[in-house]
């Protein structure tokens, strides 16, 4: 008995060939001996089967002795043994129809789970193997689960169903809803304008939801909301903004926030959360702000940084075009009695300068002591 695998929703063509290369009488029946279709001369006739409106044949092939049964919009329950009666012979074809669907939705939030469920006919024992867009293979039976979806899991998942040494392939497009970056860090000199951007890693026709930037300043004892907003069809409207700092928000995607000036009291870490319509859960992006200040107070030249810096970052004070006078893995460095000239405060990571602030030290004129 020939075995043919089909996919739910697809069209399948079951072949039946006569030895004579001419149009002769044929019938297709199911396992209950109910006639599906056949011919009467050059006319196609249909029986009382459930396939009535979905069954067809190719009249153009009858003259060549081919009498296929075409079943459109396959259903799992179409799985059956189909019998072609031609020239006093019977050809049996076993059709097994499978379906593979993703849980609830193919648009999933980063960190959520993807469950792929195989629909299969009773009595079958298929095995399934799926390959993710990043080349990861998962195997299973009726259900396959992938927990903690990552951005790289976005794309086409290719799943192969194996039954009776035959295989059928499914392709499912999965969109992982996430920000392009999980975390970002902005380095600014005191007083500079700060731009925060939160680009999304996906595109959809209509994007509706709401969000908030929650901020923990390094110098504050508790965290607080800096801004809340709504998103309607990719248009951003601010709901509530804190008095200090007075953030501004762009009206279009990507989500974009402007802090008028970087100040030490704003340095810290924020978490932008975005809730999307019809989705439970939220997208998150961490953002960090590091602020540098260089000051000269009497005979002390000081450079300080505030915010989340890694312990391997180096803070240095140097006179322009000279070797660093002081260089430490600390958040503040200073030079006593600095010589005149343009001093540079540098925050660097393995030699790469992340932030630089210049301060001019003027020469000090010693006034003669009066007799």
């Amino acid at each position: 008995k020939k075995v043919v695998l089909g996919k739910k929703g697809d069209t399948v063509e079951l072949t039946c060939t006569a030895s004579q290369k001419k149009s002769i009488q044929f019938h297709w029946k199911n396992s209950n001996q109910i006639k599906i279709l056949g011919n009467q001369g050059s006319f196609l006739t249909k029986g009382p089967s459930k396939l009535n409106d979905r069954a067809d044949s190719r009249r153009s092939l009858w003259d060549q002795g081919n009498f296929p049964l075409i079943i459109k919009n396959l259903k799992i329950e179409d799985s059956d043994t189909y019998i072609c009666e031609v020239e006093d012979q019977k050809e049996e074809v076993q059709l097994l129809v499978f379906g593979l669907t993703a849980n609830s939705d193919t648009h999933l939030l980063q960190g959520q789970s993807l469950t792929l469920t195989l629909e299969s006919p009773p009595g079958s024992s298929p095995s399934v193997q799926c390959r993710s867009p990043r080349g990861k293979n998962i195997q299973g039976g009726k259900t396959l689960s992938v927990s903690q979806l990552e951005l790289q899991d976005s794309g086409t998942w290719t799943c192969t169903v194996l039954q009776n040494q035959k295989k059928v392939e499914f392709k499912i497009d999965i969109v992982v809803l996430a920000f392009q970056k999980a975390s970002s860090i902005v380095y600014k000199k005191e007083g500079e304008q700060v731009e925060f951007s939160f680009p999304l890693a996906f595109t959809v026709e209509k994007l509706t939801g709401s969000g908030e930037l929650w901020w923990q300043a390094e110098r504050a004892s508790s965290s607080k909301s800096w801004i809340t907003f709504d998103l309607k069809n990719k248009e951003v409207s601010v709901k509530r903004v804190t008095q200090d700092p007075k953030l501004q928000m762009g009206k279009k995607l990507p989500l974009h926030l402007t802090l008028p000036q970087a100040l030490p009291q704003y340095a810290g870490s924020g978490n932008l959360t975005l809730a999307l319509e019809a989705k439970t859960g939220k997208l998150h992006q961490e953002v960090n702000l590091v602020v540098m200040r260089a000051t000269q107070l009497q005979k002390n030249l000081t450079c300080e940084v505030w915010g989340p810096t890694s312990p391997k970052l180096m803070l240095s004070l140097k006179l322009e075009n000279k070797e660093a006078k002081v260089s430490k893995r600390e958040k503040a460095v200073w030079v006593l009695n600095p010589e005149a000239g343009m001093w540079q405060c540098l925050l660097s990571d393995s030699g790469q300068v992340l932030l630089e602030s210049n301060i001019k030290v003027l020469p000090t004129w010693s006034t003669p002591v009066q007799p």
């Epitope: 509706t208 909301s225 509530r240 959360t273 859960g281």
Partner: antibody, heavy 119, light 107 residues
Framework: EVQVVESGGGLVQPGGSLRLSCAAS????????MSWVRQAPGKGLEWVAN????????YYVDSVKGRFTISRDNAKNSLYLQMNSLRAEDTAVYYC????????????WGQGTLVTVSS | DIQMTQSPSSVSGSVGDRVTITCRAS??????LAWYQQKPGKAPKLLIF???SLQSGVPSRFSGSGSGTDFTLTISSLQPEDFATYYC?????????FGQGTKVQIK
């Protein structure tokens, strides 16, 4: 530790006035919106009014508009609710609440002060 | 004003039961929804904010879901200290409004 403590409740005749106060501590009061929420005996919660950090914006539920006034004194870390033309249906426990939670949630509640309007 | 309708108004359960409370908004409120727990003679306590995020210090048996107009609070395994009244509240537009409350009582 964040704390909000209400005071000023009591028995008042219909048509009378009362001023509720709320003393806040343990957080930077001037950085938060504040709300008053009430609960009539055996009933559910009803939001009454709120006020922006520096007091420039105030919102009220329709049933108290024109009768109640919310105000704050950031120098004293205090929130107030001036209630005039009181009615029997204003009888409730009044809670002072900080609107400091994420997604505009009401995160810290006082223990409440009971206002009884009766002749 | 946005009306918030909770159901059921009361539910009886035993320790270990799974309890689900629903809240429906008369118009879309995105995810501007919070859930509170109130015990007799006490002030309400914030459980869930932004429809689905758990407030710090709240046990993980509490969870929230939904967006738009339909929201759910689930207690996965009822504990003796969970017998209380639960309220949903919208923060989408003024005036903020609460649901009428759902009393969770011992069966």
């Amino acid at each position: 530790e964040v704390q909000v403590v209400e005071s000023g409740g009591g028995l008042v005749q219909p048509g009378g006035s009362l001023r509720l106060s709320c003393a806040a501590s343990g957080f930077t009061f001037s950085s938060y919106w504040m709300s008053w929420v009430r609960q009539a005996p055996g009933k559910g919660l009803e939001w009454v009014a709120n006020i922006k950090e520096e007091g420039s914006e105030k919102y009220y539920v329709d049933s108290v508009k024109g009768r109640f006034t919310i105000s704050r004194d950031n120098a004293k870390n205090s929130l107030y609710l001036q209630m005039n033309s009181l009615r029997a249906e204003d009888t409730a426990v009044y809670y002072c609440v900080r609107e400091g939670g994420q997604w505009l949630a009401l995160d810290y509640w006082g223990q409440g002060t009971l206002v009884t309007v009766s002749s | 004003d946005i009306q918030m309708t909770q159901s059921p108004s009361s539910v009886s359960g035993s320790v270990g039961d799974r309890v689900t409370i629903t809240c429906r908004a008369s118009q879309g409120i995105s995810s501007w929804l919070a859930w509170y727990q109130q015990k007799p003679g006490k002030a309400p306590k914030l459980l869930i904010f932004g429809a689905s995020s758990l407030q710090s210090g709240v046990p993980s048996r509490f969870s929230g879901s939904g967006s738009g107009t339909d929201f759910t609070l689930t207690i996965s395994s009822l504990q003796p200290e969970d017998f209380a009244t639960y309220y949903c509240q919208q923060a989408n537009s003024f005036p903020w409004t609460f649901g009428q409350g759902t009393k969770v009582q011992i069966k």
